[in-house]
Interface confidence: low
C-alpha cells in the first residue's frame, strides 16, 4: 500500500471527511477526471487539482497534528505527478505563486501573451505545422 | 495573422507592457515553457498559465475599453488550448473556481484524495503498468 493512503485516512479524520454525506451534491474532481481519457487532457485537469491541494495544504502548514500526513502526501504527489523531477515541481510552484494583482506581473504577462498563445496548440512547435502556417501567411 | 495578435497589442498599450524594461528580471512563462518539450509536461505548465490569464482577465472584465480584446483572446485560447471543446473548457473553469477556504470543498477534496492520488501517475490506469509495478513490489 502506498504511504499516502494511511496519511490520507488521517486527514479524513481531521477534516471530518469520512462521512457518507460528504459525497452529497456530486464530486469535485473525480467526475471531471472520468470525462478525460487522453493523457494531455488529463494533465490539464490534474494540474489544477494538484495546485488546489498544494494551496489547501499550505493553509494548514502550521498545524502540527497533520504536518506529517501533509508532508507524506505532498512527497507522494511529487513522485507520482512530477516524476520526482525537482525542476518540474519548482517550475509548477513558480507558476502557481504568481499574483494576478502584482503590477509587474501583470505587465510581464501581457508582454509575453503573444508568444504564449503561439505555443498553446499541441502541434505549434512541429515543422509540419510551421510550414502549413506559412502557406496561409501570404 | 491570428485575431489575438492585434488584440494583444491593444492590451500591451493598456497595461503599459510594450516597453523594453518589462523584460527586466526574466520572464514569467516563456522561460518555463522552454524547459518542457514533452506534451504532457507542457500541458501541466500551460494549464497554470491559462488559468492565470483567465484570472487576470476576470479582474478587468468590467473595463469597456479592453473588453473586446479580452473576449477575442479568451476565444482564441478556447480554440487553441481547449480545441473548441466546451466541455473541456467548462470542466477546467469548474476546477479553477473551487475555493480552498470553503469547508464543504475542503471536506470533499480530502474525501476524494486517495482516488485522485491513485490516478496521478500517467499509466496508472493501464494493466501493463500495474503488472510491472507488481514485480517491483516484492
Amino acid at each position: 500500500q502506498d504511504p499516502y493512503v494511511k496519511e490520507a485516512e488521517n486527514l479524513k479524520k481531521y477534516f471530518n471527511a469520512g462521512h457518507s454525506d460528504v459525497a452529497d451534491n456530486g464530486t469535485l474532481f473525480l467526475g471531471i477526471l472520468k470525462n478525460w481519457k487522453e493523457e494531455s487532457d488529463r494533465k490539464i485537469m490534474q494540474s489544477q487539482i494538484v495546485s488546489f491541494y498544494f494551496k489547501l495544504f499550505k493553509n494548514f502548514k502550521d498545524d502540527q497534528s497533520i504536518q506529517k500526513s501533509v508532508e507524506t502526501i505532498k512527497e507522494d504527489m511529487n513522485v507520482k505527478f512530477f516524476n520526482s523531477n525537482k525542476k518540474k515541481r519548482d517550475d509548477f510552484e513558480k507558476l502557481t505563486n504568481y499574483s494576478v494583482t502584482d503590477l509587474n506581473v501583470q505587465r510581464k504577462a501581457i508582454h509575453e501573451l503573444i508568444q504564449v498563445m503561439a505555443e498553446l496548440s499541441p502541434a505549434a512547435k512541429t515543422g509540419k505545422r510551421k510550414r502549413s502556417q506559412m502557406l496561409f501567411r501570404g | 495573422q491570428d485575431p489575438y495578435v492585434k488584440e494583444a497589442e491593444n492590451l500591451k498599450k493598456y497595461f503599459n507592457a510594450g516597453h523594453s524594461d518589462v523584460a527586466d528580471n526574466g520572464t514569467l512563462f516563456l522561460g518555463i515553457l522552454k524547459n518542457w518539450k514533452e506534451e504532457s509536461d507542457r500541458k501541466i505548465m500551460q494549464s497554470q498559465i491559462v488559468s492565470f490569464y483567465f484570472k487576470l482577465f476576470k479582474n478587468f472584465k468590467d473595463d469597456q475599453s479592453i473588453q473586446k480584446s479580452v473576449e477575442t483572446i479568451k476565444e482564441d485560447m478556447n480554440v487553441k488550448f481547449f480545441n473548441s471543446n466546451k466541455k473541456k473548457r467548462d470542466d477546467f473553469e469548474k476546477l479553477t473556481n473551487y475555493s480552498v477556504t470553503d469547508l464543504n470543498v475542503q471536506r470533499k477534496a480530502i474525501h476524494e484524495l486517495i482516488q485522485v492520488m491513485a490516478e496521478l501517475s500517467p499509466a496508472a490506469k493501464t494493466g501493463k503498468r500495474k503488472r510491472s509495478q507488481m514485480l517491483f513490489r516484492g
Partner: nanobody
Framework: QVQLQESGGGLVQPGGSLRLSCAAS????????MSWVRQAPGKGLEWVSS????????TYADSVKGRFTITLDNAKNTLYLQMNSLKPEDTAVYYC?????????RGQGTQVTVSS
C-alpha cells in the same frame, strides 16, 4: 507631464474607514485609466482598483471587493478611494497611478496603517 498628489492616509483601527484623495493635473488626453495601487512592507506593487475616465468602467481586486469604492470627480480632477472595514493586511503605502495612453505616472504615496 502628469502630476499626482495623494492624501488622506493615517492610522486606523481594524474595522475602521479612511478616504484617500488624489489630486491630478497635467492631463492632455481624455483616454486614461486611473488606479489605486499599494505596496505593503517588503512586497511588490499590488493593483487595488481602476476607473476608466472614458467609459466609467470600474474594477477591483478580489481582496478589496465590497469594502473599497473608487470614484473620480472629473470636474475637480480628483480620484478618491473610500476604504471601509479595513484589515491589518490593508496596511501599505497607497499610490494613485494614471495610465495615460501607454505611459504610467505615479504619485508619492500616502501611508495607511491598520492596527489596534
Amino acid at each position: 507631464q502628469v502630476q499626482l498628489q495623494e492624501s488622506g492616509g493615517g492610522l486606523v483601527q481594524p474595522g475602521g474607514s479612511l478616504r484617500l484623495s488624489c489630486a491630478a493635473s497635467g492631463f492632455t488626453s481624455s483616454n486614461y485609466a486611473m488606479s489605486w495601487v499599494r505596496q505593503a512592507p517588503g512586497k511588490g506593487l499590488e493593483w487595488v482598483s481602476s476607473i476608466n475616465s472614458r467609459t466609467g468602467s470600474i474594477t477591483y481586486a478580489d481582496s478589496v471587493k465590497g469594502r473599497f469604492t473608487i470614484t473620480l470627480d472629473n470636474a475637480k480632477n480628483t480620484l478618491y478611494l473610500q476604504m471601509n472595514s479595513l484589515k491589518p493586511e490593508d496596511t501599505a503605502v497607497y499610490y494613485c497611478a494614471s495610465r495615460v495612453d501607454d505611459r504610467v505616472s505615479r504619485g508619492q504615496g500616502t501611508q495607511v496603517t491598520v492596527s489596534s
